[in-house]
């Protein structure tokens, strides 16, 4: 491991379309990729009238947008589908929305997902 960096070897896995995609619904996903490239975890979700619906969680390939992020936080303002990525095992277990334009309180509390 590189000093000061948490390597990602596994992530929380969830797939809302597990039947269509013929995958597991929930679990832990081991992360594979080129040995010299970084690996991350991600979460995607929708906000349907204030209710959080997880779309997918899993491993994410080397992405500078995710470097050194220990927390999974979406910063884009009002996306159609929320996306966040992070580094460290299972770092996508919790995810949050803190739009970058906001300098005061976040518009939503951190989410600890409980898949339906």
């Amino acid at each position: 491991a590189i000093l000061g960096r948490s390597e990602t070897q596994e992530c929380i896995f969830y797939n809302a379309n597990w039947e269509r995609d013929r995958t597991n619904r929930t679990g832990v996903e081991p992360c594979y990729g080129d040995k010299d490239k970084r690996r991350h975890c991600f979460a995607t979700w929708k906000n349907i009238s204030g209710s959080i619906e997880i779309v997918k969680q899993g491993c994410w390939l080397d992405d500078i947008n995710c470097y050194d992020r220990t927390d999974c936080i979406e910063k884009k303002d009002s996306p159609e589908v929320y996306f966040c990525c992070c580094e460290g095992n299972m770092c996508n277990e919790r995810f949050s929305y803190f739009p970058e334009m906001e300098v005061t309180q976040p518009t939503s509390n951190p989410v600890t997902p409980k898949p339906p």
Epitope: T44, D63, E80
Partner: antibody, heavy 115, light 111 residues
Framework: QVQLVQSGAEVKKPGSSVKVSCKAS????????INWVRQAPGQGLEWMGT????????SYAQKFQGRVTITADTSTSTAYMELSSLRSEDTAVYYC????????WGQGTLVTVSS | QSALTQPRSVSGSPGQSVTISCTGT?????????VNWYQQHPGKAPKLMIY???KRESGVPDRFSGSKSGNTASLTISGLQAEDEADYYC???????????FGGGTKLTVL
């Protein structure tokens, strides 16, 4: 092994649209971006845009804004690039590439725009 | 985002070293370690050689190396071989909040 297989060559009339596909295999499609790049005959590489394959979020080069649409179908692990209002200058080989580093490329699709 | 600037051509004899430069600005090349280098042989798709300024892609010979100084990234090929004759492009990471851009390409001729 990772593979990106693109659709075949197309000949189009000026003013029409073209839709090029890029089918991914050998990795989890929803674990990265797909980028689209074009190369006109004898010219350099030109970045067109990118899609986050899991969220569907897109970014486009300013030059192509309003004329290009990139989509992804996660059920078939396929990305699409549609370019509208074609003109002769759009004659080029169009490539898809995986991830932000463009570490794997499709074989390219020649699109010829001619009346 | 403006295109990155590369020399149109460079040449060298077998066994020699050549360096290809890629100049950007303080807001792209200068401030981020996200420049990549691609090799393209005629009629073929580009191939990633170096990513993140200096990381060699898996399977790429260690004759290829990347570096950066200020707003200029460089690709150095040492111990030049005939099969290194190709076009070389620098480019940036693209995805999320980052927009892609390529240099104009450099034709490397092995004399």
């Amino acid at each position: 092994q990772v593979q990106l297989v693109q659709s075949g060559a197309e000949v189009k009339k000026p003013g029409s649209s073209v839709k090029v596909s890029c089918k991914a295999s050998g990795y989890t499609f929803t674990s990265s971006y797909i980028n689209w790049v074009r190369q006109a005959p004898g010219q350099g590489l030109e970045w067109m845009g990118t899609i986050n394959a899991v969220s569907g979020s897109t970014s486009y080069a300013q030059k192509f804004q309003g004329r290009v649409t990139i989509t992804a179908d996660t059920s078939t692990s396929t990305a699409y690039m549609e370019l509208s209002s074609l003109r002769s200058e759009d004659t080029a080989v169009y490539y898809c590439a995986r991830g932000g580093w463009f570490d794997y490329w499709g074989q390219g699709t020649l699109v010829t725009v001619s009346s | 985002q403006s295109a990155l600037t590369q020399p149109r051509s460079v040449s060298g004899s077998p066994g020699q070293s050549v360096t290809i430069s890629c100049t950007g600005t303080s807001s792209d090349v200068g401030s981020k370690n996200y420049v990549n280098w691609y090799q393209q042989h005629p009629g073929k798709a580009p191939k990633l050689m170096i990513y993140g300024v200096s990381k060699r892609e898996s399977g790429v010979p260690d004759r290829f190396s990347g570096s950066k100084s200020g707003n200029t990234a460089s690709l150095t090929i040492s111990g030049l071989q005939a099969e290194d004759e190709a076009d070389y492009y620098c480019g940036t990471f693209a995805g999320g909040k980052y927009y892609g851009v390529f240099g104009g390409g450099t034709k490397l001729t092995v004399l």
